[in-house]
């Protein structure tokens, strides 16, 4: 069964800046990755970025840089300032759509006890 992993890290240099990394463990052709916060995209979450392997990347504030790390993993850096910036207990979710298996998603947040720079 395919799985999705999510890591959330707060940057040591910018305490309100986050890096989210997500990966897909499974076979099939990844068609789309959707990153959201505040819950899954289909359950009230707000889309931060959509990554397509052929048609490019779309991102919305406070997302600063979304990119493919490998064919099956992505990373997203969030801006740390402004009214829409994330807080330490924000939930981030990644949904990988794989053809023809379907979609697989997982969520993660910064561990309560984590220091800046520590991975979830």
């Amino acid at each position: 069964t395919p799985e999705v992993w999510v890591q959330v890290r707060m940057e040591a240099t910018e305490l309100s800046s986050f890096t989210i990394r997500c990966g897909f463990l499974g076979s099939g052709s990844i068609s789309l990755v959707t990153v959201s916060w505040g819950g899954p995209n289909g359950a009230g979450g707000t889309t931060l970025a959509v990554l397509h392997p052929e048609r490019g990347i779309r991102q919305w504030a406070p997302a600063r840089q979304a990119r493919w790390e490998t064919q099956s993993s992505i990373s997203l850096i969030l801006e740390g300032s402004g009214a829409s910036s994330p807080c330490a207990n924000t939930t981030f979710c990644c949904k990988f759509a794989s053809f023809p298996e379907g979609s697989w998603e997982a969520c993660g947040s910064l561990p309560p006890s984590s220091d800046p720079g520590l991975s979830a």
Partner: antibody, heavy 120, light 107 residues
Amino acid sequence: EVQLVESGGGLVKPGGSLRLSCAASGFTFSSYHMSWVRQAPGKGLELVSAISRDGDSTYYPDTVKGRFTISRDNAKNSLYLQMNSLRAEDTAVYYCSRHEDYFGFAMDSWGQGTLVTVSS
Amino acid sequence: EIVMTQSPPTLSLSPGERVTLSCKASQSVSNDVAWYQEKPGQAPRLLIYYVSHRFTGIPARFSGSGSGTDFTLTISSLQPEDFAVYYCHQAYRSPWTFGQGTKLEIK
């Protein structure tokens, strides 16, 4: 304008074979996953085969597995369905459809359909 | 396999009426739900994707809603051309499945 045009349907005896074709135009065929969906007389819609944009991943339900083979030729903008060991219950209108990754794999374009009748 | 159950199977209504069609999934399908309209002798047509997004050219009287396992398609004021069969569809998990359809007929 997106166009999908099916051909190859007809009357065939039980146990016989048919090859359906779908000619695509008006879009970059190689960027889209494709499917064959059928509708038997008085019945609902059934997805009978799907293929990823690069042709590497395919899907078949148990009802046709081992009898039907989906393939594509991206150089010719064409989708195919080879149907062997046909049965009376395979009688249906067969539609070629295009999946849109950005729409959760919803099928946003359909052909007009080609009728396959399996009867002795 | 995720089973999509539509209700009712048939509805008899008059033009101008408001109608709500129901689709229930046997397990959560996130937001990967679409609705199609099919008329006799015509190919199915995509109406709604991602639960609530209207496809290009679809009139505003069509709307979709729901989450998790319960989804609805609403037509705010039926027009003569809306009498057809409507199918919900999930592409969340393979095997992708359709509901059995709801037929809207003129009363």
